[in-house]
Structure formats: C-alpha cells, structure tokens
C-alpha cells in the first residue's frame, strides 16, 4: 500500500537516457506522443514533474519475512497527464487522468550505476521503462542477469 495519498516530495526534472538522448513530449491530434531524440543544442529540455511516494511492502510479499519500504514515482510532463504502463501492449503512454491515479501510473524507483535510475512497473515486477527504436517501451529484465541494461537507465537533471 502507498503510505498516505500525498507524495513525500516532488521535483521538476528533465529525463534523458544513459546515452544522453532527451525524452520529449509533443501534442499531436489532441493526444501526447513521447519521443527519444537528440536535442539541438539551443533547444530547451522538456521537464517532468516527479512525485515520490513511500510504499509499505508487507513481509508476506517481500519474500524475506521483513516489512520494507519502496520509493515509487509518478511522472507528469504536463498538467493532468501521467506516464502509464500499458502491459498488454508493452508500451508507455501518456494518459489524462484524475487522482487517485491508477496503479499503472506508479513506478518503483531503482538507483543504478553512473547516478542513473530505472523505473519498474508497480503492476508488473521485473518490467521496466526502457528505450526501444527511439520510443519508450516496457522491457522485461532478468534482474540478476541484466544489471547493466543501458536501455533501462535514465538520468534526471533539474
């Protein structure tokens, strides 16, 4: 369960890949598209509002008999729109929604090497936001074998 309904903190940051490509958002035909692209030097990076929530993970689910806490995030590039996991399509989409947000909008935050982070689907453990063919997609990762998967590493910069 997510502790309380308010985030413990929020920050505005631009999101880029391990290879320094920018994640950008464009309004097309009344819906938002998500792109992964090299930005021209003078172009301003899109900002995303990251809301951080603390989630209690009961020992019955944790597998090691100990209650634990996880840090979950929601990502909103523009008012009332949130990134959501579409597990059926293995895609990442922007949807307009009202609070309380659906579980598909929550991602478990992982600290990774090189001060990067990864976003794991709350609704589908082992599945992460990643980059595929210059788009964001959901990528299944064997956590023990695929630690360095660069396509699921992201940088946050304020």
């Amino acid at each position: 369960s997510i502790t309380g309904i308010s985030p413990i903190t929020e920050s505005l940051a631009s999101l880029s890949t391990y290879n320094d490509q920018s994640i950008t958002f464009a309004l097309e035909d009344e819906s938002y598209e998500i792109y992964v692209e090299d930005l021209k030097k003078d172009k301003k990076k899109d900002k995303v509002l990251l809301s951080y929530y603390e989630s209690q993970h009961p020992s019955s689910e944790s597998g090691d008999g100990v209650d634990g806490k996880m840090l979950m995030v929601t990502l909103s590039p523009t008012k009332d729109f949130w990134l959501q996991a579409n597990n059926k399509e293995h895609s990442v989409e922007l949807h307009k929604c009202e609070k309380p947000l659906p579980d598909q909008a929550f991602f478990v935050l992982h600290n990774r090497s090189f001060n990067c982070v990864s976003f794991e689907c709350k609704t589908d453990p082992g599945v992460f936001i990643g980059v595929k063919d210059n788009h964001l997609a959901l990528i299944k990762v064997d956590y023990s074998e695929n630690l360095g998967s660069e396509n699921i590493l992201f940088k946050l910069s304020e």
Epitope: I8, T9, D64, G65, V66, M70, L109, L147
Partner: antibody, heavy 121, light 106 residues
C-alpha cells in the same frame, strides 16, 4: 530482525591490504543496497562506497583506485577490500543498509556496530 | 562531487532549549538529505530522511526542513541524551557525502 555485523583484522601493516566482511541477516541483498562508511577516531563520517541491489557499485572518488566492494549472496555477505593502506586509514569501518528497496534516497536506518582497523607497523 | 557544508561545528545550549543546525549543498539535491545523530562509541542513528520525514521511532521534537541547496535541522526541548554529534548527508548522487558534523554541548 535486520542485522549487519562487520568483522575485520583489527591491525594492518602499512602498504598491506584490508579485507572486511559484513554478515547480514533479516533482508535480501537482491533488494537492498549495502554501503561502507568509515570514521577516523574523533572525526566525522566518510562514505566509502556502495554495492547496490542490482549488483552495480559506486565509490568515493578519492579512494576509488584502492577500493573494491563485492558480495556472496548465498552467504549473505558483503566484502570491502582496500589496498595500499596508510596510517590515516585507521578508522572504525561500518556497513549499513539502505532504507528503501532498490534505492539510496532514504538514507540508512540499519548500521553495523563497526569494526576498528588500526594501520600501524 | 557534491560538497556538504554543515554549521556550526559546535554549539552550546541548555536543557529544554531549541537549537538549529544548517547544511548547505554545493549543488541542488532536491529533498534527498538525511540527518543522523551519533552518541560516543555508537553507530549513527537516522533521525530525518527526505529532508523532512521523521524516521520510525524518532520523537517529534526533531524536525527537518529545506530543499534544493539549503537545509535545516531543529531540536526542540533539548534532553540530556541530545548533547552528542549530528551529521547531514546528501543522497541525491553518488558519492553520498556527509557534512562535517556538529557537536552539541551542554
């Protein structure tokens, strides 16, 4: 319950290497990062490095060339190895666990009791 | 690396008073700051995380505030066990640096 316990050699000769083992219980190394911190007697705290849940490592920039951190998940052990010790490496060495699964943002709730390492001829 | 400047290095106070310690980060760290206290010969204890969140079991007379680069830590109604050392630590990016510490004296 969650426990971390360091075991070290106590005394190390200058220019030799240091190996400390952190035995952990009550949690899984595949879910939590373990960090090493040291404290020179009467001084402040120095963060040395981390072995993250995913297996990647991070190190103190000034000590990176002399440090390595590894683990044996089957034995629930994390290891700190430090080469070419000097007298100013004399300190209490702590292993600590992340507050959050997979993330260091929440600081460190659980600390070992520390092991004193003296570097002296 | 992010430098953490903690002040004062030492402070005198009396039982029942309030004290404030500050920590400045050399670059923005969002809210990713923790405060610890350490009794002599003991391991540090987490008091505050995410700049303002009280760790489990920590009395409400401890509080934290700030974000970005400037942070404060306050103890109200000082008790005898509070006259020890305190440290801030940034957890925004590795290496996770500590402030130099503050010794609270009676």
């Amino acid at each position: 319950q969650v426990q971390l316990k360091e075991s070290g050699p106590g005394l190390v000769a200058p220019s030799h290497s240091l190996s400390i083992t952190c035995n952990v219980s009550g949690f899984s190394l595949s879910k939590y990062g373990v960090h090493w911190i040291r404290q020179i007697p009467g001084r402040g705290l120095d963060w040395l490095g981390v072995l993250r849940a995913g297996g990647s490592t991070g190190y103190n920039s000034a000590l990176m060339s002399r440090l390595s951190i590894s683990k044996d998940s089957s034995k629930s052990q994390v290891f700190l190895k430090m080469n070419d010790l000097r007298t100013d490496d004399t300190a209490v060495y702590f292993c600590v666990r992340d507050h959050y699964y997979y993330s260091s943002y929440g600081g460190f709730v659980y600390w070992g009791q520390g092991t004193l390492v003296t570097v002296s001829a | 690396d992010i430098q953490m400047t903690q002040s004062p290095a030492s402070q005198s106070a009396s039982l029942g008073e309030s004290v404030t310690i500050t920590c400045l980060a050399s670059q923005t760290i969002g809210a990713w700051l923790a405060w610890y206290r350490q009794q002599p010969g003991k391991s540090p204890q987490l008091l505050i995380y995410a700049a303002t969140r009280l760790a489990d079991g920590v009395p409400s007379r401890f509080s934290g505030s700030g974000s970005g680069t400037e942070f404060s830590f306050k103890i109200n109604n000082l008790q005898a066990e509070d006259f020890v050392s305190y440290y801030c630590q940034q957890l925004d990016s590795s290496p996770y640096t500590f402030g130099g510490g503050t010794r609270l004296e009676m």
